[in-house]
């Protein structure tokens, strides 16, 4: 009978082991070991036993001890089991962005490692075990599917192998892959809300606001705002899970017509868009034309109001007949028309919305000078020593200068409070003079002496 010790050995790959072969008889005819492994006999042995050192054990092997005794030949095998940790434990790359609510498949590849019966593969979220499977195949591939929520954003996923040789080897061998960080996102199915003017006048500034709720992580969201070919530069305000992008837009005459306003919110690998039509229009203020802005009284004046060809105008609140872009009327200039305002209001319909403009012009009427009985009475009778204010108002445009003189030298103090004396009595020649000429009027002042009883 041939014996081998130890009958089973677990050793690391490339390791060495001492194996004792012994025969049951005292003087075996022959005693040895048969193995492809490099072996070295450790001397001295005994009459019926030999010790061998097997080195560089790379794979499982069954060295065989044999002995030849008088009662016959026999053999015995020792079982060498080689263990080694995997050479590669790798978690397949995660998608750059994973939508919340969609399942994520984790895939781990394990190359090498033995004995496979003692090798398990785990998929982990942080330190939490998601799945535990045995390694099968070369390379071994292990997969698991997990639901993804917002709380998985930034979570680390990894793959770990465990080579458990206990109780033979009092150690648990672990290999862990490089962790992969998951980026999750939530972009709602609703398009962004776009608030903007439906019509926008050339060379004026408008404000566009684009907002969207239910975004995660909101800080990663990007907003693109454009009007036609013009990219807008929005200021973005972030809320808990919402954003609002506000931009000013100024349009030029080249952009006149219908333009598309586009707001796109990009998150992860998805985009939500909203489009709106904006009508760009040009609407200069209407023109108010007077035949002449300054005329002499009695002159006929044509007041004309003209606006955008599609506009409807009103001149001093009176609609053009028929309604349209031009209105006019004729008037004979009177002094009362001096300083009169002529207002032209225009309404333009742009894509169903009404926009308004107006323009005002003033008429100057030249008249006078004029001295009327009403404003410059020809006769005053005042009691002596009373306080009086001589009044004489000259009218005209331009405003005339007024002088009232007695005997060409003595002035009547117009508009001043005076004490009536005998010297004030007499006839004054009042003269109103402007660039348009002069008029005169006689004014007599009578002074009543007090009666003494």
């Amino acid at each position: 009978q041939t014996s081998v010790f130890p009958p089973e050995v677990i050793l690391p790959r490339g390791g060495s082991v001492k194996v004792n072969c012994s025969a049951s008889c005292d003087q075996p005819i022959s005693l040895g070991m048969e193995t492809p492994l490099p072996k070295k006999e450790i001397l001295p042995g005994g009459n019926n036993w030999k010790m061998y050192e097997l080195s560089n054990v790379q794979e499982d092997s069954q060295p065989m001890c044999y002995s030849n005794c008088p009662d016959g030949q026999s053999s015995a095998k020792t079982l060498l089991t080689v263990y080694w940790t995997p050479e590669r434990v790798e978690l397949a790359p995660l998608p750059p962005w994973q939508p919340v609510g969609k399942n994520l498949t984790l895939r781990c590849q394990v190359e090498g490692g033995a004995p496979r019966a003692n090798l398990t593969v785990m998929l982990l979220r942080g330190e939490k075990e998601l799945s535990r499977q045995s390694a099968v195949g070369e390379p071994a591939e292990v997969t698991t599917t997990v639901p993804v929520g917002r709380d998985d954003h930034g979570a680390n996923f990894s793959c770990r192998t465990e080579l458990d040789l206990r109780p033979y080897v009092l150690k648990l061998f672990e290999n862990t892959s490089a962790p992969h960080q998951l980026q999750t996102f939530d972009l709602p199915a609703t398009p962004p809300q776009l608030v903007s003017p439906q019509v926008l006048e050339v060379d004026t500034q408008g404000t566009v606001v684009c907002s969207l709720d239910g975004l995660f992580p909101v800080s990663e969201a990007q907003v693109s705002l454009a009007l036609g070919d013009q990219k807008l530069n929005p200021t973005i305000t972030y809320g808990n899970n919402s954003l609002s992008a506000k931009a000013s837009v100024k349009v030029t005459a080249e952009e006149e017509g219908t333009q598309q306003l586009l707001c796109g919110v990009m998150l992860g690998n998805q985009t939500q868009e909203t489009r709106q039509t904006v009508t760009i229009y040009s609407f200069p203020a209407p023109n108010v034309n007077l035949t002449k802005p300054e005329v002499s009284e009695g002159t006929e004046v044509i007041v004309e109001c003209e606006a955008h060809p599609r506009a409807k105008v009103m001149l001093n609140g009176v609609p053009a007949q028929p309604p349209g872009p031009r209105a006019q009327f004729l008037l004979k200039a009177t002094p009362e028309d001096n300083g009169r305002s002529f207002s032209c209001s225009a309404t333009l319909e742009v894509a169903g919305q009404l926009v308004h403009k107006n323009q005002t012009r003033e008429l100057r009427v030249l008249y006078g000078p004029r001295l009327d009985e009403k404003d410059c009475p020809g006769n005053w009778t005042w009691p002596e020593n009373s306080q009086q204010t001589p009044m004489c108002q000259a009218w005209g445009n331009p405003l005339p200068q007024l002088k009232c003189l007695k005997d060409g030298t003595f002035p009547l103090p117009i508009g001043q409070s005076v004490t009536v004396t005998r010297d004030l009595e007499g006839t004054y020649l009042c003269q109103a003079r402007s660039t348009r000429g002069e008029v005169t009027r006689e004014v007599t002042v009578n002074v009543l002496s007090p009666r003494y009883e």
């Epitope: 599609r310 001149l315 001093n316 609609p319 309604p323 309404t347 319909e349 169903g352 919305q353 009404l354």
Partner: antibody
Framework: QSVEESGGRLVTPGTPLTLTCTVS????????MSWVRQAPGKGLEWIGI?????STYYASWAKGRFTISKTSTTVDLSITSPTTEDTATYFC???????????????????WGPGTLVTVSA | AYDMTQTPASVEVAVGGTVTIKCQAS??????LSWFHQKPGQPPKRLIY???TLASGVSSRFKGSGSGTQFTLTISGVESADAATYYC????????????FGGGTEVVVK
Amino acid sequence: QSVEESGGRLVTPGTPLTLTCTVSGFSLSNYYMSWVRQAPGKGLEWIGIISDSGSTYYASWAKGRFTISKTSTTVDLSITSPTTEDTATYFCARDWSYDSTSGYYYYDMDLWGPGTLVTVSA
Amino acid sequence: AYDMTQTPASVEVAVGGTVTIKCQASQSINSWLSWFHQKPGQPPKRLIYKASTLASGVSSRFKGSGSGTQFTLTISGVESADAATYYCQQGYSRSDGEHVFGGGTEVVVK
């Protein structure tokens, strides 16, 4: 000045229908005209408008379902493919006014027709 | 779009009482607002235009006020003939996709 609708009747779903609004006492070349409808027991719902020059604008829900056109004295509302939800009284209204104080025109339904009833039923 | 929000949807008032109906525009419509009332089987009748101007033949018991986005219709000394549905209408825009009328207010006179 008056406005009167006609053409309302009982139709089966999908049968095209045209309503006519006849105006008198004013010219359609000077005014905008709107169509408004009212389903039984419901509020007023603006359908669309035609301008003095013939431009048309529609409520978002009415786009593609209704077409407004006009002649010198009539304004037509065509219901392309009526459904039971289109059962309503249809009104035609003059929708244009001006304010002599500001000198501006604005939309205002100052003149209405009595309405015409459209019933869509299988 | 100019959304018109009318409140309340329904109101009950005693004869001789006062009723107030509010209309809010989502954007400024200046003073371009009209008020209508409608009785069953009849077309709407304009009561007030330009926010506060009384239409001809309309009782001075009806008073409109407001500008910009907030408007009010007040009916004082309510009569049984005032029982109707009241609507506000913006006169600023008839763009594609526009909202023109408020949702209406039913006035019930007790």
